[in-house]
């Protein structure tokens, strides 16, 4: 694509190239043959994050605590506010407009990856030799107890939801 009539950081208006406003500023008036582009800084709680010819700055995002949101990074005149979720919650979308409670892994499943402010808990089924008997957002699958190391024998086999039950070895008479 060949270059356009105006250079980078310029825009074409009424047969002339005007300078764009820098990030953090909005357009007040276009340049003329005799005057430069006039720009003004964005107000409190406003921002523009690109070289622009916008006549209004964007409002910073509001992190609504009623939706489980809190401020992760305060906005500036050049950046939007970044929201994240309260402890135990995660964002429902990349834009993080609302939060949902982290899911718990049911008995028979363990936590593969603990949830963050932006991603949910990832569960995995407990493989043979492991179990989880609780619904939890933190607990991994636990290995079955090794009866042998305790000089005991398996009295009841373990499942993905229950540990093995160990008991004393039968004595020879």
């Amino acid at each position: 694509e060949p270059p356009t009539a105006c250079r980078e950081k310029q825009y074409l208006i009424n047969s002339q190239c005007c300078s764009l406003c820098q990030p953090g500023q909005k357009l007040v008036s276009d340049c003329t043959e005799f005057t430069e582009t006039e720009c003004l800084p964005c107000g409190e709680s406003e921002f523009l994050d690109t070289w622009n010819r916008e006549t209004h700055c964007h409002q910073h995002k509001y992190c609504d605590p009623n939706l489980g949101l809190r401020v992760q990074q305060k906005g500036t005149s050049e950046t939007d506010t970044i929201c994240t979720c309260e402890e135990g919650w995660h964002c429902t979308s990349e834009a993080c407009e609302s939060c949902v409670l982290h899911r718990s892994c049911s008995p028979g499943f363990g936590v593969k990856q603990i949830a963050t402010g932006v991603s949910d808990t990832i569960c995995e089924p407990c493989p043979v030799g492991f179990f989880s008997n609780v619904s939890s957002a933190f607990e991994k699958c636990h290995p079955w107890t090794s009866c042998e190391t305790k000089d005991l024998v398996v009295q009841q086999a373990g499942t993905n939801k229950t540990d093995v039950v160990c008991g004393p070895q039968d004595r020879l008479r």
Epitope: P2, C6, N14, S15, C17, E33
Partner: antibody
Framework: EVQLVQSGAEVKKPGESVKISCKAS????????IEWVRQMPGKGLEWIGV????????NYNEKFKGQATLSADKSISTAYLQLSSLKASDTAVYFC?????????WGQGTLVTVSS | DIQMTQSPSSLSASVGDRVTITCRAS??????LNWYQQKPGKAVKLLIS???RLHSGVPSRFSGSGSGTDYTLTISSLQPEDFATYFC?????????FGQGTKVEIK
């Protein structure tokens, strides 16, 4: 005094090309855009495109993309409009104009007649 | 593309008359509206740029006004040399577009 002097009238056959020149004087050639406009017989004005003579950047009207080519030679303060694959319907007066706030100064126009 | 609708397409007036030509854009053009005068065999002349700014050398009987989509060119007292065709043109959004013209004739 700002002046834009265009090349003389042209008669072309369908399918041929034409290159019109527009020589600027009386101002800094690279400081202003050059616009090109078409006026068909008895009709209104139609914008073709614009060139920045400083570095050759262009914008075209979609309608003329592929048929019109704008260029400029800084060393002789001259802008050019080339039209290819001419048709009878391309018969018109072609104007160059200097930008600024609007089309501030115009050339006298170049009549291109396309006829077999 | 932005459509520019000029009215009237022609008018007859006498020397000394006040003449008004209007131009309506199909969308807001933020005052980037220019007026031109064309006479047969002569170079086109810019009269007014950016709605109301008189181009250098243009007599003060010419004036422009308007905003948004509606714009007006006024000649306060028509002179013999003002008989010509007038065009409006928007410079807000590519492609630049022109009104179809208003021919001002002698009554």
């Amino acid at each position: 005094e700002v002046q834009l002097v265009q090349s003389g009238a042209e008669v072309k056959k369908p399918g041929e090309s034409v290159k019109i020149s527009c020589k600027a004087s009386g101002y800094g050639f690279t400081n202003y855009l050059i616009e090109w406009v078409r006026q068909m017989p008895g009709k209104g004005l139609e914008w073709i495109g614009v060139i920045n003579p400083g570095y050759g950047g262009v914008n075209y009207n979609e309608k003329f993309k592929g048929q019109a080519t704008l260029s400029a030679d800084k060393s002789i303060s001259t802008a050019y409009l080339q039209l290819s694959s001419l048709k009878a319907s391309d018969t018109a007066v072609y104007f160059c104009a200097r930008g600024g706030s609007g089309f501030a100064f115009w050339g006298q126009g170049t009549l291109v007649t396309v006829s077999s | 593309d932005i459509q520019m609708t000029q009215s009237p397409s022609s008018l007859s007036a006498s020397v000394g008359d006040r003449v008004t030509i209007t131009c309506r854009a199909s969308q807001d053009i933020s005052n980037h509206l220019n007026w031109y005068q064309q006479k047969p065999g002569k170079a086109v002349k810019l009269l007014i740029s950016s709605t109301s700014r008189l181009h250098s050398g243009v007599p003060s009987r010419f004036s422009g006004s308007g905003s948004g989509t509606d714009y007006t060119l006024t000649i306060s007292s028509l002179q013999p040399e003002d008989f010509a065709t007038y065009f409006c043109q928007q410079g807000n959004t590519l492609p630049w577009t022109f009104g179809q013209g208003t021919k001002v004739e002698i009554k």
